[in-house]
């Protein structure tokens, strides 16, 4: 393992597809992949009138957008389906939405909003 890199070996698993069929498939997914590829965890969810509806959680495979992210944070502004990925065992247990504001005029007192966390 490379020093400073969080190896992902397992992730929280949830799949709404299966839940609809009452197969109760929720738990811990072991992550597999090529030795030279990185493995990540992810979460994807919808925000329906303020209510969080998880769609899927599990392992994600080698994606530069997930490299060295210890927290699962969606940064896109108002996506239809929220998605975040991270590195480290079970790092997708908690996920958050923290949109990156496109600041045109810097304010004298910039405020960093605290991201809402879901789990």
């Amino acid at each position: 393992a490379i020093l400073g890199r969080s190896e992902t070996q397992e992730c929280l698993f949830f799949n709404a597809n299966w839940e609809k069929d009452r197969t109760n498939q929720t738990g811990v997914e072991p992550c597999y992949g090529d030795k030279d590829k990185r493995r990540h965890c992810f979460a994807t969810w919808k925000n329906i009138s303020g209510s969080i509806e998880i769609v899927k959680q599990g392992c994600w495979l080698d994606d530069i957008n997930c490299y060295d992210r210890t927290d699962c944070v969606e940064k896109k502004d108002s996506p239809e389906v929220y998605f975040c990925c991270c590195e480290g065992n079970m790092c997708n247990e908690k996920f958050s939405y923290f949109p990156e504001m496109e600041v045109t005029q810097p304010t004298s007192n910039p405020v960093t909003p605290k991201p809402p966390y879901y789990n």
Partner: antibody
Framework: QVQLVQSGAEVKKPGSSVKVSCKAS????????ISWVRQAPGQGLEWMGG????????NYAQKFQGRVTITADESTSTAYMELSSLRSEDTAVYYC?????????????WGQGTMVTVSS | EIVMTQSPSSLSASVGDTVTITCRAS??????LAWYQQKPGKAPRLLIY???SLHSGVPSRFSGSGSGTHFTLTISSLQPEDFATYFC?????????FGPGTKLEIK
């Protein structure tokens, strides 16, 4: 590297059942996601259902609900697909396939396929 | 059920050409879109998963893009072994569904 080896070709009568096996080797079978996909001659691909052996319960495409049963035997690392009430339209090559992840990112390893012919 | 459509249904091209195949989903599938190549008498082969990730061992001339309902597979600098049928597949919601296929033929 996982390998999937399927049972041989079958010829069946309309109204009967067929059970196709798929033996996995090369990794922890119970933590694979195994799907069954079929392809009628000269036609496209059709997903029938899938199973994670560790959970034991399968998810089926509505079209096959009640007619297909997907099971897994962890002791022999073998998955099975049984299709009942066969009709001529069920003539197809049946593939067992491993998915990259439990959330189904892509079907990366395919068995060699089992030809099932339904004919009177 | 999510219906997948592909265009064109067939196309002719020459070695060295760049071709693009389009896949559309009847409703959003986020990034849960894969591309497969199939040759006669053989099982399909995974090329692209998660809309744009290249599967192990697949040449870099294959690339995928898109999200939601509109996806593309691009093959640059076509090689003789690339002439085959290509399928897209969504696995966002069950039943997982495939496109009808695009047959790529030598001009």
């Amino acid at each position: 590297q996982v390998q999937l080896v399927q049972s041989g070709a079958e010829v069946k009568k309309p109204g009967s059942s067929v059970k196709v096996s798929c033996k996995a080797s090369g990794r922890e079978f119970e933590s694979l996601f195994i799907s069954w996909v079929r392809q009628a001659p000269g036609q496209g691909l059709e997903w029938m259902g899938g199973i994670i052996p560790i959970y034991g319960t399968a998810n089926y495409a509505q079209k096959f609900q009640g007619r297909v049963t997907i099971t897994a035997d962890e002791s022999t690392s073998t998955a099975y697909m049984e299709l009942s009430s066969l009709r001529s339209e069920d003539t197809a090559v049946y593939y067992c396939v491993k998915d990259l992840t439990w959330t189904n990112l892509g079907l990366d390893i395919w068995g060699q396929g089992t030809m099932v012919t339904v004919s009177s | 059920e999510i219906v997948m459509t592909q265009s064109p249904s067939s196309l002719s091209a020459s070695v060295g050409d760049t071709v693009t195949i389009t896949c559309r989903a009847s409703q959003g599938v986020s990034r849960w879109l894969a591309w497969y190549q199939q040759k006669p008498g053989k099982a399909p082969r995974l090329l692209i998963y998660a809309a744009s990730s290249l599967h192990s061992g697949v040449p870099s001339r294959f690339s995928g893009s898109g999200s939601g309902t509109h996806f593309t597979l691009t093959i640059s600098s076509l090689q003789p072994e690339d002439f085959a049928t290509y399928f897209c597949q969504q696995s966002y919601s069950t039943p997982f569904t495939f496109g009808p296929g695009t047959k790529l033929e030598i001009k």
